[in-house]
Interface confidence: medium
């Protein structure tokens, strides 16, 4: 039988990619459930994930209201089977999260090469612009919309027949590179925010895409499109 003893949550951790933001914590509950609150430094607390037995709470809807704000969350522990009573004045145990600033701290998701097109000795490589849950005027914004010129992409490319890699950079979503005639190339891209000085400065590399593979030969003046 469960008791009414509750323990404070611990190991509160923000997991955020392309602004999709989840707060995680320990422990898996035994005799308790959790409620999460979130606020900005100057704002009021807002409760989310009421009396949940989960050890995570999706706070995306709150942080996308202003991704440049700094947020703090806290996790309250209540006895399992708890029904909020108006007479209770005792504050349940809780733990604060680290501060979280989405614009500075959200991880960059793995990018995808949308297409590449070869014309002569030039190849145009296009990176798919990822949609986020950040809104402006009821419209969802893309990663590029949110970060603007703060976001660049690095292209790694190499001849299929060799391992020597070259790089190119762009602050749009397109690259135009020179290639050797008659050679097939492979491509991979990485999203980067150069102004960041932390481990989340770069995304993981995109899946490698190669000319002349799987979806038809890439003719010298033809097109080779990848749709994901």
């Amino acid at each position: 039988s469960g008791t009414t003893n509750t323990v404070a949550a611990y190991n509160l951790t923000w997991k955020s990619t392309n602004f999709k933001t989840i707060l995680e914590w320990e422990p898996k509950p035994i005799n308790q459930v959790y409620t999460v609150q979130i606020s900005t430094k100057s704002g009021d607390w807002k409760s989310k994930c009421f009396y949940t037995a989960d050890t995570e709470c999706d706070l995306t809807d709150e942080i996308v209201k202003d991704v440049k704000q700094t947020y703090l969350a806290r996790v309250f522990s209540y006895p399992a089977g708890h029904v909020e009573s108006t007479g209770s004045t005792e504050e349940p145990p809780y733990e604060n999260s680290p501060e979280f600033t989405p614009y500075l701290e959200t991880n960059l998701g793995q990018p995808t090469i949308q297409s590449f097109e070869q014309v002569g000795t030039k190849v145009n490589v296009t990176v798919q612009d990822e949609w986020t849950l950040v809104r402006r005027n009821d419209t969802f914004l893309s990663l590029r919309d949110v970060f603007g010129k703060d976001l660049i992409y690095t292209l790694y490319y190499w001849k299929s027949s060799s391992s020597g890699k070259k790089t190119a950079k762009t602050n749009t979503n397109e690259f135009l590179i020179d290639v050797d005639k008659g050679e097939n190339y492979c491509f991979s891209v990485q999203a980067v925010i150069p102004s960041r000085r932390t481990a989340n400065r770069k995304s993981t590399d995109s899946p490698v895409e190669c000319m002349g593979h799987e979806k038809g030969e890439s003719r010298e003046t033809g097109h080779h499109h990848h749709h994901h």
Epitope: S1, T3, P27, K28, I30, A53, D54, T55, D58, A80
Partner: antibody
């Protein structure tokens, strides 16, 4: 009745990435359980690799964390394991399992109540 | 990491005898997180006991679990021929979740 089935290559070359998928049938992967990977080296005991919740949040064994990725595809009712830079020491039977939170009389209990049959993975060149 | 130490490593008994298996944790484990499993050669583990003392669905009542804190016990009151197998305890509360090294119950 929920059943789990592991699938993936039985032979992986050293330094490559081991990839396995667990297909959940007879129930939804989004039904509030955690989904784990466990392995068993030949003639040895059981080692927990990590788990994932249907929403995608993960917990990993710190001894393997740098090499492990567990992901979930709710549309296919599957979850997957990737273990990079494998060596012969990763040769084992790999099991997927359901880690169930069970609420009873004011408290929660946790246990792995449904297991796949296991798939043998050999790391060799 | 919570280390679970099972003893004895091997238990040689005859059908009809009583088997007592021990699982000792390196630090206190809530009983809500403690489970016992049975594994036969070539098969996946099978849940026997959860919450340290609750029998899983379909498990005969000759299997019972007890204990709290750092000391847990699985008891098989009268061994049947199908009970000869390896038994593992497990804690699923603190990452990394860990299993004991196993106790092999073999026919004497």
């Amino acid at each position: 009745q929920v059943q789990l089935q592991e699938s993936g290559p039985g032979l992986v070359k050293p330094s490559q990435t081991l990839s396995l998928t667990c297909t959940v049938s007879g129930g939804s992967i989004s039904s509030g359980q955690y989904w784990s990977w466990i392995r068993q080296h030949p003639g040895k005991g059981l080692e927990w690799i990590g788990e994932i919740y249907y929403s995608g949040s993960t917990r990993y064994n710190p001894s393997l964390k740098s090499r492990v990725t567990i992901s979930v595809d709710t549309s296919k009712n599957q979850f997957s394991l990737k273990l990079s830079s494998v060596t012969a020491a990763d040769t084992a039977v790999y099991y997927c399992a359901r880690d169930t939170p069970y609420y009873y009389d004011g408290g929660y209990y946790y246990y792995m109540d449904v297991w796949g049959k296991g798939t043998t993975v050999t790391v060799s060149s | 990491e919570i280390v679970l130490t099972q003893s004895p490593g091997t238990l040689s008994l005859s059908p009809g005898e009583r088997a007592t298996l021990s699982c000792r944790a390196s630090q206190s484990v809530s009983s809500s997180y403690l489970a016992w499993y049975q594994q036969k050669p070539g098969q996946a583990p099978r849940l026997l006991i959860y919450g340290a003392s609750s029998r899983a669905t379909g498990i005969p009542d000759r299997f019972s679990g007890s204990g709290s804190g750092t000391d847990f016990t699985l008891t098989i009151s009268r061994l049947e021929p199908e009970d000869f197998a390896v038994y593992y305890c497990q804690q699923v509360g603190v990452v990394p979740y860990t299993f004991g090294g196993g106790t092999k119950v073999e026919i004497k």
